[in-house]
């Protein structure tokens, strides 16, 4: 049974005579008259088992003491620490010449843990041990201070175990403590890689290369390696591991980010506080969830604050110029916390009678500089229809607008384009033809471009070729032209007029009056 004694973490004790309870029971040769196991009291009045010999009277002493078998435990080099007291030969009058002040240390490798006898020729000498300090007498109080400590190492070892032996050649000596240990580089964590307990190499200059394994919740950046030096110290760390996303290094471990913190990538960074307008409710967050009403764009880094769509643009002003409209506005009061704001223009053409019945303006309308993705706060819209109700919506958008269904980011204005000269009348018809008259009817222009104030009918005899013509004006979309000559070809043109002026004449309608007093109904442009 051994008691616990504290030694450096890089030393593994194979034998400690001070920790043995009861007798050590090592083998002495000769059995009597040489080394003797003696219990002495330490400074705390605790018994210590020592081996003593003080055969200083006779020459040619050869007293051997052998330990029990010591397992090697895979070590290739072991260290022997001997604490001993050696009496100065000068304190023993009359023994000069026979008294010595050294002893010899030996070892013998063996797979047999039950060897009963000491065979001196099997043992290999490690060293002759001399005292740094020897003294005449030692009292119990001083003894601990005056102990000599010598450490020797031996290797490479290859068998399962070994025996140590101490040869006395005539000294007055007490072995107070014998400790045998090997050195290891103790389990350690460096750069987030764990390196296992590693026994040092066979010789005092060897380095053992050891590959580390990443600690929990981490991954290799570069292959982690270290070298275990002969003194049990780790040397030259190479490579490292990085804490996984959602984890940070704390006390050599990768620990989950605390609530309210996150880490997006495997880096050596620490967890960061959730950006503004976001939160995490679990430990180990790799990103933070946006607050209600806040969003993160696809290409936003996890470190960016959550943002929201902008509010509506402000101060929308319209300027109508005939069939063009210039719109200007101010930036929204709230940009949602983003810089990537832009504007989209929506054009709707609405009926005069029922403004709710609007439909898209279509592709005929043109926008300068563009309809969507405007970076400026103005746009010019052209190729509108004259005298038409339009509603223009200016939408403020940013990188997260698409996530928000609420249409509160637009401002709208309804305008009516100015009146313009109407377009030409597409179809003029002769409804009745007599000897002296022609009844005409026509459709409203495709684009009245305002309120049609009147229609103007220009006609002339074909032979005159417009050198002499007459004008008839009417507010209606039909008229009777009277006082014509029978059996004569006439050409008719119709145009409409708004407050903005006349439109173009229609294509000519050629009609020939009858010779008989009967009525001829015509529907073509060239009734005869």
């Amino acid at each position: 049974v051994t008691g616990s004694r504290v030694y450096p973490a890089n030393e593994v004790t194979l034998l400690d005579s001070r920790s043995v309870q009861g007798e050590l029971g090592w083998i002495a040769s000769p059995l009597e008259g040489g080394w003797e196991e003696v219990s002495i009291m330490d400074e705390k009045n605790t018994p210590i088992r020592t081996y003593q010999v003080c055969n200083v009277m006779e020459p040619s002493q050869n007293n051997w003491l052998r330990t029990d078998w010591i397992t090697r435990e895979g070590a290739q080099r072991v260290y022997i620490e001997i604490k001993f007291t050696l009496r100065d030969c000068n304190s023993l009058p009359g023994v000069m010449g026979t008294c010595k002040e050294t002893f010899n240390l030996y070892y013998y490798e063996s797979d047999n843990d039950k060897e009963r006898f000491i065979r001196e020729n099997q043992f290999v000498k490690i060293d002759t041990i001399a005292a740094d300090e020897s003294f005449t007498q030692v009292d119990i109080g001083d003894r601990i201070m005056k102990l000599n400590t010598e450490i020797r190492d031996v290797g490479p070892l290859s068998k399962k175990g070994f025996y140590l032996a101490f040869q006395d050649v005539g000294a007055c000596i007490a072995l107070v403590s014998v400790r045998v240990f090997y050195k290891k580089c103790p389990l350690t964590v460096r750069n987030l890689a764990q390196f296992p307990d590693t026994i040092t190499g066979a010789d005092t200059s060897s380095l053992v290369e050891v590959r580390g394994s990443c600690v929990n919740n981490s991954e290799e950046k570069d292959v982690p390696k270290m070298y275990c030096g002969a003194d049990g110290e780790w040397l030259v760390p190479i490579g490292n591991c990085l804490c996984n996303a959602g984890h940070e290094e704390r006390s050599g471990e990768c620990q989950a980010c605390k609530i309210g913190y996150y880490k997006a990538l495997s880096t050596d960074a620490t967890c960061a506080k959730c950006p503004p307008h976001s939160y995490s409710v679990w430990e180990g967050a790799t990103s933070c969830t946006c607050d209600r009403g806040f969003f993160r764009a696809d290409n936003d880094a996890a470190s960016m604050p959550c943002t929201r769509p902008p509010s509506a643009p402000l101060n929308l002003i319209s300027n109508v110029n005939e069939t063009s409209v210039n719109l200007e506005w101010s930036s929204p009061q709230n940009t949602g916390g983003r810089q990537d704001i832009s504007y989209n223009v929506v054009c709707k053409k609405c009926g005069a009678g029922d403004p709710s019945k609007c439909r898209p303006c279509g592709s005929g309308v043109h926008y300068t500089p563009q309809q969507n993705g405007l970076k400026t706060t103005k746009v010019s819209i052209t190729d509108l229809l004259a005298h038409t109700n339009y509603t223009f919506e200016i939408w403020a958008v940013n990188g997260v607008s698409k996530y928000n269904p609420n249409p509160d980011q637009s401002v709208s204005v309804t305008v009516t384009t100015n009146q313009a000269a109407p377009s030409s009348i597409a179809l003029v018809q002769a409804k009745e033809v007599t000897r002296y008259s022609v009844a005409l009817a026509w459709l409203e222009p495709d684009r009245p471009n305002g309120v049609i104030l009147e229609y103007e009918v220009k006609y002339y005899e074909k032979d005159q070729n417009e050198r002499s013509y007459r004008i008839v004006r009417t507010a209606a979309r039909n008229t009777d032209i009277k006082g014509l000559n029978p059996l004569t070809s006439y050409v008719f043109h119709v145009r409409a007029r708004t407050a903005a002026g006349y439109g173009d004449f229609s294509e000519p309608l050629e009609v020939t009056t009858n010779t008989v007093p009967s009525r001829i109904i015509g529907d073509g442009a060239n009734s005869t």
């Epitope: 002495i40 003080c54 023994v95 007498q137």
Partner: antibody, heavy 121, light 106 residues
């Protein structure tokens, strides 16, 4: 068994000499020093000195006169104490005792039974 | 030379009691003394020597302690066979004994 055997009592006249033998057995005689101690009647112990049984080199107590001589005959494992010019105050039991040297201090671990020397006219 | 003074000269104890014997040196010594027991008509017997080590066959009720100039022999529970005279002995270039303490039955 280790033992030291001393001779029987001696009665001597003042001025005479006496040689007290101490025969050792049960161990290697030359491996341990031999000490001599005397005890006057009703008194305490007085150390007289010791002899290196290997070399024959003696060590005498401080203040010891030249009347005390330690000697050996290793062939018969015997140590001797010779006292010359005996005085009445030399009357005592004389003990031989084997010396035990240790690194932490010395003691006399085996004692003879003692030889009473009486000096009387 | 160093003089050892033992006290008390006589110590009266009952069997089973603890006995404490003192040995004082005239000057500081660097070693604990040896202790001997002597019964009437017998040679002394070594009890304790260097570093408070009990000699062969000495029961563990005997123990020694102290340093410098003051030393103590303790008999933890006195047995009938322990009634005797006890001597301390200092070793060095010249060995000296104390004058002895007699332990008697109370």
């Amino acid at each position: 068994q280790v033992q030291l055997l001393q001779s029987g009592a001696e009665v001597k006249k003042p001025g005479a000499s006496v040689k007290v033998p101490c025969k050792a057995s049960g161990y290697t005689f030359t491996s341990r020093a031999m000490s001599w101690v005397r005890q006057a009647p009703g008194q305490g112990l007085e150390w007289m000195g010791w002899i290196n049984t290997n070399t024959g080199n003696p060590t005498y107590a401080q203040g010891s006169t030249g009347r005390f001589v330690f000697s050996l005959d290793t062939s018969v494992s015997t140590a001797y104490l010779q006292i010359s010019s005996l005085k009445a105050e030399d009357t005592a039991v004389y003990y031989c005792a084997r010396v035990r040297f240790t690194v932490y201090g010395d003691g006399m671990d085996v004692w003879g039974q003692g030889t009473l020397v009486t000096v009387s006219s | 030379e160093i003089v050892l003074t033992q006290s008390p000269a006589t110590l009266s104890v009952s069997p089973g009691e603890r006995a404490t014997l003192s040995c004082r040196a005239s000057q500081s010594v660097s070693s604990n003394p040896a202790w001997y027991q002597q019964k009437p008509g017998q040679a002394p017997r070594l009890l304790i020597y260097g570093a408070s080590t009990r000699a062969t066959g000495i029961p563990d009720r005997f123990s020694a302690s102290g340093s410098g100039t003051d030393f103590t022999l303790t008999i933890s529970r006195v047995e009938p066979e322990d009634f005797a005279v006890y001597y301390c002995q200092q070793y060095g270039p010249s060995w000296t004994f104390g004058q002895g303490t007699k332990v008697e039955i109370k």
